[in-house]
């Protein structure tokens, strides 16, 4: 009876289990009753990082110097190239596809430490009583306005992104 499932590192094709190609190799032809799976190593500047049945290897990532990128770790037949940014610049994401001078802290966050040549901006959440309504690479969280010192009352509570709104006190007639 033909199998309905195969072991790890195998795949089901034409009612039989074939071996997957190992990392660094691509599939040339499926196995048959009489032959093993045929695999070929990935070419220069190509890779496959899993046991697979891919017929094409993936191209290594290109670290574009025009975007401020350089190679941090050269790719192999089993791993992709890892890019990083030029000194003083910072990756915009985990994948490091572009570089920024420094990242900003979003509304609700303030700058704890301004970026330096070696470290990016460090942000911190605005605690209760403080807010930030801007994206900035230098502005700290600002304290809520004190309505009391202006002889006013809080009409709308503040949040981590908005200041309190003050208004006149209700006068007793």
């Amino acid at each position: 009876e033909p199998p309905t499932a195969c072991r790890e590192k195998q795949y089901l094709i034409n009612s039989q289990c074939c071996s997957l190609c190992q990392p660094g190799q691509k599939l040339v032809s499926d196995c048959t009753e009489f032959t093993e799976t045929e695999c070929l190593p990935c070419g220069e500047s190509e890779f496959l990082d899993t046991w697979n049945r891919e017929t094409h290897c993936h191209q290594h990532k290109y670290c574009d110097p025009n975007l401020g990128l350089r190679v941090q770790q050269k790719g192999t037949s089993e791993t992709d190239t890892i890019c990083t940014c030029e000194e003083g610049w910072h990756c915009t994401s985990e994948a490091c596809e572009s570089c920024v001078l420094h990242r900003s802290c979003s509304p609700g966050f303030g700058v704890k430490q301004i970026a330096t040549g070696v470290s990016d901006t460090i942000c911190e959440p605005c605690p209760v009583g403080f807010f930030s309504n801007v994206s900035s690479a230098f502005e700290k969280c600002h304290p809520w306005t004190s309505c009391e010192t202006k002889d006013l009352v809080v009409q709308q509570a503040g949040t981590n992104k908005t200041d309190v709104v003050c208004g006149p006190q209700d006068r007793l007639r």
Partner: nanobody, 116 residues
């Protein structure tokens, strides 16, 4: 396309003054926080000063506090850096930058040399 064109650099004696300008185009200048960043020969990038979009809040590195003043004219899409009491250690290429500042938008900068 973002363009930032710095000007106003030159050779100045210690104790002298210079005013740098940065003409911005390709983006809505009034919406962006702007920075002055410098790079001394053989050194890393140093963030010198910053200003919020409205021009109401500023930041200065300790090394320039009390000597440099950042300002902006949103009607002219221009950023300024007034530099007084210049020292030899202020010698650097000065760049203006927007937030966020992508590498590909980085300009040539303007060279400030403080020397006798």
């Amino acid at each position: 396309e973002v363009q930032l064109l710095e000007s106003g650099g030159g050779l100045v004696q210690p104790g002298g003054s210079l005013r740098l300008s940065c003409a911005a185009s390709g983006f809505t200048f009034r919406d962006y926080e702007m920075w002055w960043v410098r790079q001394a020969p053989g050194k890393g990038l140093e963030r010198v000063s910053a200003i919020n979009p409205q021009g109401t809040r500023t930041y200065y590195a300790d090394s320039v506090k009390g000597r440099f003043t950042i300002s902006r004219d949103n009607s002219k899409n221009t950023l300024y850096l007034q530099m007084n009491s210049l020292r030899a250690e202020d010698t650097a290429v000065y760049h203006c930058a927007k937030l966020p500042m992508f590498f590909e938008d980085w300009g040539q900068g303007t060279l400030v040399t403080v020397s006798n």
